[in-house]
C-alpha cells in the first residue's frame, strides 16, 4: 500500500449499504489537511454527481441507483494552482440493496413512497415532454410545408434562409460544446435537505463543489507512475501527486 | 504486546534544547502514524502534530510551528520531540500516541518538561 | 478548526449513579469522534470512537451516541475506577482538536 500515511480516508456515511433510492455521504478525510478532494468510480461509469468535480470534504449521493454501487476512491489536494493530487485513498465499497429506502432506515434518505413518486412524476413529465415534442414537430412540418406551397404562389422570399442549418455546426469542437460550462470554474452549493423535513438529526450539511476545466492530465516522475491510474469517469485531470514522500504502508481503518 | 514507552522527566532553562523519545513496541512501527499532544498542568490535551512513519515527513499544528521538531530512528522504532529555545510556557508533560483511523488508540507514559530559570 | 465544546467542565457523582457527558462540535463531523478517559498523573485511555464503537475491554456500563455535532458519553452505575478526567476529540481530520475535559469526581 504506496503512501499508506499520507493518503486520504475515503468512508460512506451512514453506511456503505445503500438502499435504493437512499442517499449517502461519502467523505474523504485526511492526516495533510488536505481541503479538496476528488472523488472516482474505480469501474469507470460516470456517477453524474462526482463527474469532473472538486468536493470539499464531503458528497452526498442519491437518490441512489444500481448504477452507483461499485468502488470509490478519492484523492486530496490543496486548492492551489496547478492542482496536484495526492495518492488514491484506500477502495471503498458502495453496495446498493433492491429495496427501496425506508423512511426510518437513515436520517438523510426520503422515505420510499416519495422515492416512487418522484419517479413517477419524472416518467409521466418525460412522456408528456416527449409527446408535446412529437406533436410540435408536426406541427412545425406541417406548417413549413405550407409556406413553402405559399412561398412557391405568391413568390415570397425562401423560409429556407431563416432555418437553422444543422451540418453548420459540425465544425465546432464537439467537446467544447458538450463542456462549455468547464471553461471556466463554476461554484455550486446543494444543501442536503432542510431542518424542518428532519428534525433530531445531524444538522444539514452543503455539500461544495467546483467543476473542473478540462486541463490535460500532467505526466508523472517516474517514481509516481503507479500512481497514475486516471481519475476515471469522475475527473480526466489526474496530475503529480501533491506528497512527494511516497512509500508503502498498511494502515488499518476501523470501520464506522 | 503494544507499547509506547517514553523517556524520562526533563528540567531546562529557557533557551535550551531537550529531546524527548518514544519507543514503540509490540506492533509493525511504519504502519502507523506517531502523533504528539501536550498537556499543560492542570490544562486539557493539544494536538501538536504527527511523524509519517514510513517516510519521517513531519506535519506540525499551527502554534507548533518553529521551534519544535519530530524526528524518527525506524531502526530503534523510536519517534522524536526536539524543542529549541525552550520557554516557561513550554513546561507541560508531552504524550507520544499512535494513529489508527485518526483517532488514538495507545498512548505513551508521558514525560514531563520543567522550564524554569 | 473544529472546535469542541464539553460540558459540563466538572461532575460529582455517586458510585452506582449514571452520569452523561456532552460534547458539542462547531460543524458536522457525521460520527467522527472518539472518547478519552485520563486518571491523574496517566495517560488518556481510549473509551470510544467513531461516536458509538466501544474499545475492546471497556466495561460495557460506557456507552457513546450522537452524529452531526451533538454526541455523549453516558456511564451507567458509576465504579470507583471511573473517576477522572474525560475528554472528547474529532477525528474527522487536522487539526485534531480536544474538548476542554470533564473533571468526573466522587461525590
Known amino acids: 500500500h504506496e503512501g499508506g500515511q499520507d493518503k486520504p480516508l475515503l468512508s460512506a456515511w451512514p453506511s456503505a449499504v445503500v438502499p435504493r433510492g437512499g442517499h449517502v455521504t461519502l467523505l474523504c478525510r485526511s492526516r495533510l489537511g488536505f481541503t479538496i478532494f476528488s472523488l472516482y468510480k474505480e469501474d469507470g461509469v460516470p456517477v453524474p454527481e462526482l463527474y469532473n468535480k472538486i468536493f470539499w470534504k464531503s458528497i452526498l449521493m442519491g437518490p441512489v441507483t444500481p448504477a452507483h454501487a461499485g468502488t470509490y476512491r478519492c484523492r486530496g489536494s490543496h486548492p492551489r494552482s496547478p492542482i496536484e493530487w495526492s495518492a488514491p485513498s484506500n477502495p471503498l465499497v458502495i453496495v446498493v440493496t433492491g429495496n427501496s429506502s425506508s423512511s426510518s432506515s437513515s436520517p438523510t434518505e426520503p422515505s420510499s413512497k416519495t422515492g416512487i413518486r418522484r419517479h413517477l412524476h419524472i416518467l409521466i413529465g418525460t412522456s408528456v415532454a416527449i409527446i408535446l415534442f412529437i406533436i410540435l414537430f408536426f406541427f412545425l412540418l406541417h406548417c413549413c410545408c405550407s409556406n413553402k406551397k405559399n412561398a412557391a404562389v405568391m413568390d415570397q422570399e425562401p423560409a429556407g434562409d431563416r432555418t437553422v442549418n444543422r451540418e453548420d455546426s459540425d465544425d465546432q469542437d464537439p467537446q467544447e460544446v458538450t463542456y462549455a460550462q468547464l471553461d471556466h470554474c463554476v461554484f455550486t452549493q446543494t444543501k442536503i435537505t432542510s431542518p424542518s423535513q428532519r428534525p433530531k438529526t445531524p444538522p444539514t450539511d452543503t455539500t461544495m463543489y467546483m467543476e473542473l476545466p478540462n486541463a490535460k492530465p500532467r505526466s508523472l516522475s517516474p517514481a509516481h507512475k503507479h500512481h497514475s491510474q486516471a481519475l476515471r469517469g469522475s475527473s480526466r485531470e489526474t496530475t503529480a501527486l501533491s506528497q512527494n514522500r511516497v512509500a508503502s504502508s498498511h494502515v488499518p481503518a476501523a470501520g464506522i | 504486546q503494544i507499547q509506547l514507552v517514553q523517556s524520562g522527566p526533563e528540567l531546562k532553562k529557557p533557551g535550551e534544547t531537550v529531546k524527548i523519545s518514544c519507543k514503540a513496541s509490540?506492533?509493525?512501527?511504519?504502519?502507523?502514524?506517531m502523533h504528539w499532544v501536550k498537556q499543560a498542568p492542570g490544562k486539557g490535551l493539544k494536538w501538536m502534530g504527527w511523524?509519517?512513519?514510513?517516510?519521517?515527513?513531519?506535519t506540525y499544528a499551527d502554534d507548533f510551528k518553529g521551534r519544535f521538531a519530530f524526528s524518527l530512528e525506524t531502526s530503534a522504532t523510536t519517534a522524536y520531540l526536539q524543542i529549541n529555545n525552550l520557554k516557561n510556557e513550554d513546561t507541560a508533560t508531552y504524550f507520544c500516541?499512535?494513529?489508527?483511523?485518526?483517532?488514538?488508540?495507545?498512548w505513551g507514559q508521558g514525560t514531563t518538561l520543567t522550564v524554569s530559570s | 478548526d473544529i472546535q469542541m465544546t464539553q460540558s459540563p467542565a466538572s461532575l460529582s457523582a455517586s458510585v452506582g449513579e449514571t452520569v452523561t457527558i456532552t460534547c458539542r462540535t462547531s460543524?458536522?463531523?457525521?460520527?467522527?469522534l472518539a472518547w478519552y478517559q485520563q486518571k491523574q498523573g496517566k495517560s488518556p485511555q481510549l473509551l470510544v470512537y467513531?461516536?458509538?464503537t466501544l474499545v475492546e475491554g471497556v466495561p460495557s456500563r460506557f456507552s457513546g451516541s450522537g452524529s452531526g455535532t451533538q454526541f455523549s458519553v453516558k456511564i451507567n452505575s458509576l465504579q470507583p475506577e471511573d473517576f477522572g478526567n474525560y475528554y472528547c476529540?474529532?477525528?474527522?481530520?487536522?487539526?485534531?482538536?480536544f474538548g476542554g475535559g470533564t473533571k468526573l469526581e466522587i461525590k
Open positions: 500516541s499512535r494513529d489508527v483511523d485518526l483517532y488514538f488508540d495507545y
Open positions: 509490540g506492533y509493525t512501527f511504519t504502519d502507523y502514524s
Open positions: 511523524i509519517n512513519t514510513e517516510t519521517g515527513g513531519p
Open positions: 460543524e458536522n463531523i457525521y460520527s467522527y
Open positions: 467513531n461516536a458509538k
Open positions: 476529540q474529532h477525528h474527522y481530520g487536522i487539526p485534531f482538536t
